[in-house]
């Protein structure tokens, strides 16, 4: 018996087609993805093949103005229209709290939404009961297939699930649910979830009875043969893991942003064992036409977005200096504003010992593309912010050693004075440079804000300590020459859309007045500093 699994993950509000790098589509003839194009391909496969499942491994939420405006209603509407068969909860599904998941998505989805390792407690337990499930048995042709879901255990640090949801260890939570399905004579089981490729592989290895793992969170691109676009494969598709009980378990993921449709064909024997598996992600490029009815629906929903982008979010009573003359040479107040918003967006009081789990932010000055003038009645709109942050990136959470951070700050000024983008703006960090010293040895003081403290204060950076830092995905991926971050990071979790983070902060504060306040100091002659 043959099953075709079509899968997406980490779509992050890319409902409309995008450019090749998943940012805003400029030249339509070269654009990719989007739900209208996805639907064309899915329907083509459904017509051609008998047993097809369309699955999503989480993180539909967050990423473009679509989510900012529609808050998940767009996800339910268009996933229903595409007739998804099941979805796993990702960490970003909790970005607007549990209510922001229940009302727009859980109550509206016509497909099961799954996670076996999220347990509700207290008053939430009855409210959310039955709205998401640990597993669902689906009819496929004349057979049945069990789909069991899982979600990153790190979600409380990455999103806003509140205090009444407990995120258990994935493997510990999955095993009894899979055992239950086996007891119920369901012999074909797919684990569908959102914990990253390393955990996907562990699930394939450790959870007895799982036949296939369909994952997300790490934006992993797998491919067999010559890849069709810019993404470099992390391994073959499917990636085969040998389980502890000796079975070959295919593991798949389909990059992100709806650029590809994962396509996996599995052959089962009559006892539900996988005999063979093969496939590849399908690049959703312009050779695949956009479905006209879905496209018309997208255009209808789009209208509200254009109205939103010109509405006032809040006011500034100071000039927001985002000029390259400032942000690539010294501390600029636009950089301070953005970093403050980044930290504010990551306030998660999950431990009594810590005032917050993260206190530090770095931001490449080259990523700040425009100032905002306060002489326009002080008004700040989404449109204004889109000029400051036009690249459609995310502000991510990484864990780094102090030594890596020190290297990053040396890189920040290694060729100072040439208006290059790597000059870092900061939050929760005090840095002093001596620009008369030779490149690679210019950081003379680097103090960072404590997290394990009731009164935050600045302490010298410790080389061997592991720190959490919020930064643009561009830097986490080694952009602007920050190879040391990419190479040495200990953990990387993708975060919220950059513009969304700043717009939420401005809306929350109502009136802003960021200052230049001595976070970054530089001098060109020798002072008698103790070298840290």
């Amino acid at each position: 018996w043959e099953l075709t699994i079509l899968h997406t993950n980490d779509v992050h509000s890319r409902l409309e087609q995008t450019s090749e790098d998943s940012s805003k589509c400029v030249n339509a003839s070269r654009c990719m993805g989007g739900v209208a194009r996805l639907f064309t391909k899915v329907q083509q496969i459904r017509r051609a093949e008998p047993n097809v499942l369309l699955l999503d491994a989480g993180d539909q939420y967050q990423g473009t103005i679509w989510f900012t405006v529609y808050k998940g209603a767009e996800v339910a509407h268009f996933m229903n229209a595409l007739r998804y068969d099941a979805m796993a909860l990702g960490n970003h599904e909790f970005d607007n709290g549990v209510e922001g998941l229940i009302e727009p998505l859980l109550k509206e989805a016509k497909f099961p939404i799954l996670s076996a390792n999220i347990k509700a407690k207290g008053p939430l337990a009855s409210q959310i009961s039955g709205l998401y499930l640990p597993y669902k048995v689906l009819p496929v042709g004349d057979e049945v297939v069990g789909i069991v879901g899982y979600t990153s255990k790190e979600t409380p640090f990455l999103s806003n699930p509140g205090t009444n949801l407990v995120f258990e260890d994935e493997i510990t939570a999955l095993q009894p649910e899979v055992d239950k399905l086996k007891t119920l004579n369901v012999n074909k089981i797919i684990a569908l979830g959102h914990s990253g490729f390393e955990m996907d592989k562990l699930i394939a290895q450790k959870v007895r009875g799982v036949d296939v793992v369909v994952g997300g969170h790490s934006n992993t691109f797998l491919y067999t043969g010559n890849p069709p676009s810019k993404e470099v494969p992390a391994g073959k598709y499917p990636f085969i893991v040998t389980s502890d009980d000796g079975r070959k378990v295919p593991v798949v993921q389909a990059y992100a942003f709806g650029k590809y449709l994962g396509y996996l064909k599995i052959e089962f024997d009559e006892r539900g064992n996988v005999i063979s598996s093969h496939g590849n992600p399908i690049l959703l490029n312009s050779s695949i036409p956009e479905d006209p009815s879905i496209k018309a629906d997208i255009n209808k929903w789009r209208i509200k977005l254009d109205n939103y982008s010109t509405q006032e979010l809040g006011k500034t009573i100071v000039y927001l200096d985002g000029s390259s003359q400032s942000c690539r040479f010294r501390e600029c107040n636009m950089g301070n504003l953005i970093c403050d918003a980044m930290i504010n967006n990551n306030l998660r009081h999950t431990d009594e010992m810590f005032w917050n789990h993260v206190s530090m932010c770095i931001l490449n000055g080259g990523g700040i593309r425009s100032p905002i003038d306060e002489r326009n009645n002080g008004t700040i709109t989404w449109e204004n912010l889109a000029a400051v942050l036009p690249f459609g990136g995310t502000f991510d959470l990484v864990q780094l050693k102090g030594s890596t951070l020190k290297k990053a700050f040396e890189h920040s000024v290694h060729r100072y004075g040439q208006s290059t983008g790597e000059f870092l703006q900061v939050g929760g960090i005090h840095v002093v440079y001596d620009l008369s010293r030779k490149p690679g040895d210019r950081v003379v003081k680097l103090d960072v804000l404590c997290t394990k403290c009731r009164v935050p204060s600045y302490d010298p950076l410790k080389m061997d300590e592991v720190y959490k830092v919020i930064l643009p995905n561009f830097l986490a991926n080694g952009g602007d020459g920050f190879q040391m971050i990419k190479d040495e990071l200990l953990r990387h979790d993708s975060g919220d859309q950059d513009i969304n983070v700043v717009s939420t902060y401005i809306s929350k504060m109502k009136v802003i007045y960021p200052a230049v306040e001595g976070r970054i100091k530089a001098h060109h002659h020798h002072h008698h500093h103790h070298h840290h």
Partner: nanobody
Framework: QRQLVESGGGLVQPGGSLRLSCAAS????????IGWFRQAPGKEREGVSC????????YYADSVKGRFTISRDNSKNTVYLQMGSLRAEDTAVYYC?????????????????????WGQGTLVTVSS
């Protein structure tokens, strides 16, 4: 082979009663949410009543509330639908369906999601 077999259908006068049975072979109904659905000629299939395996909670469509009663006998691996005060509009093919997923009885009956196991159906005709 897993099977759901409905029985008890037939011709009945308006105001009369019938008891439908759904017998399961090949699986234990204790772990399943069971539903009775019906489809009248030229109409969509609709959920009539559902019962859970765990806490025996039940759900009834508004059109049958107070007239129909769903029950289960796990020792016999059978679910029943006692139908009273029958009307002409109750005429339909009645199907039994089962889902081992932990869906609510309401979600099962709507049905919100595809249901994996179905019987062949039994015809109920209400006519004078």
């Amino acid at each position: 082979q897993r099977q759901l077999v409905e029985s008890g259908g037939g011709l009945v006068q308006p105001g009369g009663s019938l008891r439908l049975s759904c017998a399961a072979s090949g699986f234990l109904l204790d772990y399943y949410v069971i539903g009775w659905f019906r489809q009248a000629p030229g109409k969509e299939r609709e959920g009539v009543s559902c019962i859970s395996g765990s806490d025996r909670s039940t759900y009834y469509a508004d059109s049958v509330k107070g007239r129909f009663t769903i029950s289960r006998d796990n020792s016999k691996n059978t679910v029943y639908l006692q139908m009273g005060s029958l009307r002409a509009e109750d005429t339909a093919v009645y199907y039994c369906a089962a889902d081992p997923s932990p869906v609510t009885v309401q979600a099962m009956c709507l049905p919100r999601f595809p249901v994996p196991y179905w019987g062949q159906g039994t015809l109920v005709t209400v006519s004078s």
